[in-house]
Amino acid sequence: MKVLQEPTCVSDYMSISTCEWKMGGPTNCSAELRLLYQLVFQSSETHTCVPENNGGVGCVCHLLMDDVVSMDNYTLDLWAGQQLLWKGSFKPSEHVKPRAPGNLTVHTNVSDTVLLTWSNPYPPDNYLYNDLTYAVNIWNENDLADSRIHNVTYLKPTLRIPASTLKSGISYRARVRAWAQHYNTTWSEWSPSTKWYNSYREPFEQR
């Protein structure tokens, strides 16, 4: 049994790190493999993650590590029974992928403005809470070429766009993702998309 692609891990900097790797051939990850992880600290336990399949030769493990801080470092050991396949380490603060924003809502009750709001995926006491910026993707359901990205570089999880910048009588979808500049993170996954109908009509004298 051989590891084809070594484990790579990303942390949500809250409670979960996700590690993925590829084996040299088809593998029943949960039956054959175990990923052991331990915080490098004198009295820490070694926890065991039972991996799940991620494609024919791919495996994925979710490591539980509440209260992540910047100096935390974990040792990782990938075992197949009594055989050590790979040994490595992982510093969560250096490989952060934020959680996806949630509760994306579109408010169209103000006639000439579309207001999008969403929730910050972190609690206020988390280091990432005040460091997130967002990208909002809006697209025309009937014309995928009619798609745009709005960068939200302020802290408030809201975006206002003039309804007049969107085509009238068309259904649009939006989704949002996040990243944290000071932690040099990757982008989060996109939030689930939400749909609305743009019923805005230009005033008569502008037609």
Partner: antibody, heavy 129, light 109 residues
């Protein structure tokens, strides 16, 4: 220093109740591990009672014999774990230990405690009339 | 699960090699730990995951086995090793953590 300190033991009458406390210091009781209770009757072996996950998921597991009469809870703000014991019997007389445990997890919702690494000094519970 | 530990007691001299065994009633992979307990004290973790030495434990202690059969070996018994030893088996399939009945190691003679 990383340590666990149990308290609340003492003499209780059969049929009575008692709540034991386990105060953690030197580490956060809300970090990723289990907090467990183990007991030892005088001159006898060790017996697992149950565990509570100390992280954000708070799941509990109990030995089959302990379900119903024994309840484990936690107060992360006080870094303390509790063992509530009801309908006590003479055979519950034992030293009760608090212990921190490692776990096995599959995904993020299935987490099982599997060895006890750090132990408290124990507190004696005597059930007698 | 049930954990059958043997022997229940043994007598040995300083310098002796001591072996204690534990058998699980079902396959528990490597989810087995060994503990040392002295009178009036809390148990102390020696070995976890069947063969991994816990932090600060002398290298004369070793563990082996997987599945159902496990062994704790003390390669050269020291005066401070006279104590009771327990195995702990964990089965997440049946949802139990079960200790063995213990092995009391005493001074011969």
């Amino acid at each position: 220093e990383v340590q666990l300190v149990e308290s609340g033991g003492g003499l209780v009458q059969p049929g009575g109740s008692l709540r034991l406390s386990c105060a953690a210091s030197g580490f956060s009781s809300s970090s990723a591990h289990y907090m467990c209770w183990v007991r030892q009757a005088p001159g006898k072996g060790l017996e697992w009672i149950g565990c509570i996950y100390a992280g954000s998921r708070g799941s509990t597991y109990y030995a089959s014999w302990a379900k119903g009469r024994f309840t484990i809870s936690r107060d992360n703000s006080k870094n303390t774990v509790y063992l509530q014991m009801n309908s006590l019997r003479a055979e519950d007389t034992a030293v009760y230990y608090c212990a921190r445990a490692a776990f096995v997890n599959r995904g993020v919702s299935w987490i099982w405690p599997y060895y006890f690494s750090l132990w408290g000094q124990g507190t004696l519970v005597t059930v007698s009339s | 699960i049930q954990m059958t530990q043997s022997p229940s007691s043994l007598s040995a001299r300083v310098g002796d090699r001591v072996t204690i065994t534990c058998q699980a009633s079902e396959d528990i992979e490597s989810y087995l730990a060994w503990y040392q307990q002295k009178p009036g004290k809390a148990p102390k973790l020696l070995i976890y995951r069947a063969s991994t030495l816990a932090y600060g434990v002398p290298s004369r202690f070793s563990g082996s086995g997987s599945g159902r059969d496990f062994t704790l070996t003390i390669s050269s018994l020291q005066p401070e090793d006279f104590a009771t030893y327990y195995c702990l088996g964990s089965s997440y399939s049946t949802g139990s953590n079960i200790f063995g009945t213990g092995t009391k190691v005493t001074v011969l003679g």
